[in-house]
Interface confidence: low
């Protein structure tokens, strides 16, 4: 069965799934897609790495943690109700038959009130879109509402404290991380 | 196999104007950022401009800013620079170079073989 | 903007000499460092991305190293097709910048 995540409507969810590579900058190609996992590759891709790098996205479907380090957890911008359903997270070790997959659930709930931006620093708050003119530079970060503003290494801090404590739990109830190597 | 290929080049007077053209195969340019580097004769390298996967944001140099426009036409896997207002100092090799969507992994994998614009009365 | 200062502007080396070549940014650019060679009417050719990852197909005496705002590219033993100009560039923030360039010629 599927591990089960909520989001309101009008924040940010966050899926995670990780790997640890063999070595350093030794990545493994990655994609999520909407739907469950298929036999081969993932259906409806939403975001794709290759061996280097983040090489395919779509609108609201960030990378926001280290995923040179094999934090490949999505984060879905300012959801909808549309966006409930399964994601697969879709791990494609080299070899036959080898990919890891994982189907994550994502429950919409529908807001209580008008979502307005927030201060709290939890799962939705911690990993804004970061928004400038083209890159993703601190020194051009804007946050979308009035989020805290959040460099690229506060949010990998912020990764590592949120997977070393609440998201660890997840994980290894959830078994959504594997070691390659 | 991965190329880019500029076209467009050529000689015109101050406050010309010229179209260039980086024709990509290989790869599906809605995917990836392209840049447009210029080197002027015996100098080094300098970045022009660059538009993202879904033609979304474009970005320039201070130098060009209000000059030169950007633009995508992924039908056709092609990137274009429209250069209005040329200077002297614009005179250089024009290169195109394919970048990936986060900037902080945005260095430049493949470059096209350049095309010389040459500014000159 | 961003400045990258490249140092030196160029050297006169030997094949089988160890080379270093060293860039400093004038702020902080976490590792969103690449280092390209280019050779005379050639584009330029990516080698070194995000300060120290080798790039696909480049040999393994290049390499690539950061010290906070300090990056340098080792070349560990110079061969006769490395003779060639080195740039480095910032890709943290727009503009991306390079630096001036390193030309390595034959000693």
């Known amino acids: 069965s599927e591990v089960e995540y909520r989001a309101e409507v009008g924040q940010n969810a966050y899926l995670p799934c990780f790997y640890t590579p063999a070595a350093p900058g030794n990545l493994v190609p990655v994609c999520w897609g909407k739907g469950a996992c298929p036999v081969f590759e993932c259906g409806n891709v939403v975001l794709r790495t290759d061996e280097r790098d983040v090489n395919y996205w779509t609108s609201r479907y960030w990378l926001n943690g280290d995923f040179r380090k094999g934090d490949v957890s999505l984060t879905i911008e300012n959801v909808t109700l549309a966006d409930s359903g399964i994601y697969c997270c879709r791990i494609q070790i080299p070899g036959i038959m080898n990919d890891e997959k994982f189907n994550l659930k994502l429950v919409i709930k529908p807001a209580k009130v008008t979502p307005a931006p927030t201060r709290q620093r939890d799962f939705t708050a911690a990993f804004p879109r970061m928004l400038t003119t083209r890159g993703h530079g601190p020194a051009e970060t804007q946050t979308l509402g009035s989020l805290p503003d959040i460099n690229l290494t506060q949010i990998s801090t912020l990764a590592n404290e949120l997977r070393d404590s609440r998201l660890a739990n997840d994980l290894r109830d959830s078994g959504a991380t594997i070691r390659i190597g | 196999e991965v190329q880019l290929v500029e076209s467009g080049g050529g000689l015109v007077r101050p406050g010309g104007s010229l179209r260039l053209s980086c024709a990509a195969s290989g790869f599906n340019i809605s995917n990836y950022a392209i840049h447009w580097v210029r080197q002027a004769p015996g100098k080094g390298l300098e970045w022009v401009a660059d538009i993202t996967p879904d033609g979304g944001y474009t970005d320039y140099a201070d130098s060009v800013k209000g000059r030169f426009t950007i633009s995508a036409d992924t039908s056709k896997n092609t990137a274009y620079l429209q250069m209005n207002s040329l200077r002297a100092e614009d005179t250089a090799v024009y290169y195109c170079?394919?970048?990936?969507?986060?900037?902080?992994?945005?260095?430049?994998?493949?470059w096209g073989q350049g095309t010389l614009v040459t500014v000159s009365s | 903007d961003i400045q990258m200062t490249q140092s030196p502007s160029s050297l006169s080396a030997s094949v089988g000499d160890r080379v270093t070549i060293t860039c400093r940014a004038s702020q902080d650019v976490n590792t969103a460092v690449a280092w390209y060679q280019q050779k005379p009417g050639k584009a330029p050719k990516l080698l070194i991305y995000s300060a120290s990852f080798l790039y696909s197909g480049v040999p393994s005496r290049f390499s690539g190293s950061r010290s906070g705002t300090d990056f340098t590219l080792t070349i560990s033993s110079l061969q006769p097709e490395d003779f060639a100009t080195y740039y480095c560039q910032q890709h943290y923030t727009t503009p991306p910048t390079f630096g001036q360039g390193t030309k390595v010629e034959i000693k």
């Open positions: 170079a394919r970048g990936y969507v986060y900037r902080m992994w945005d260095s430049f994998d493949y």
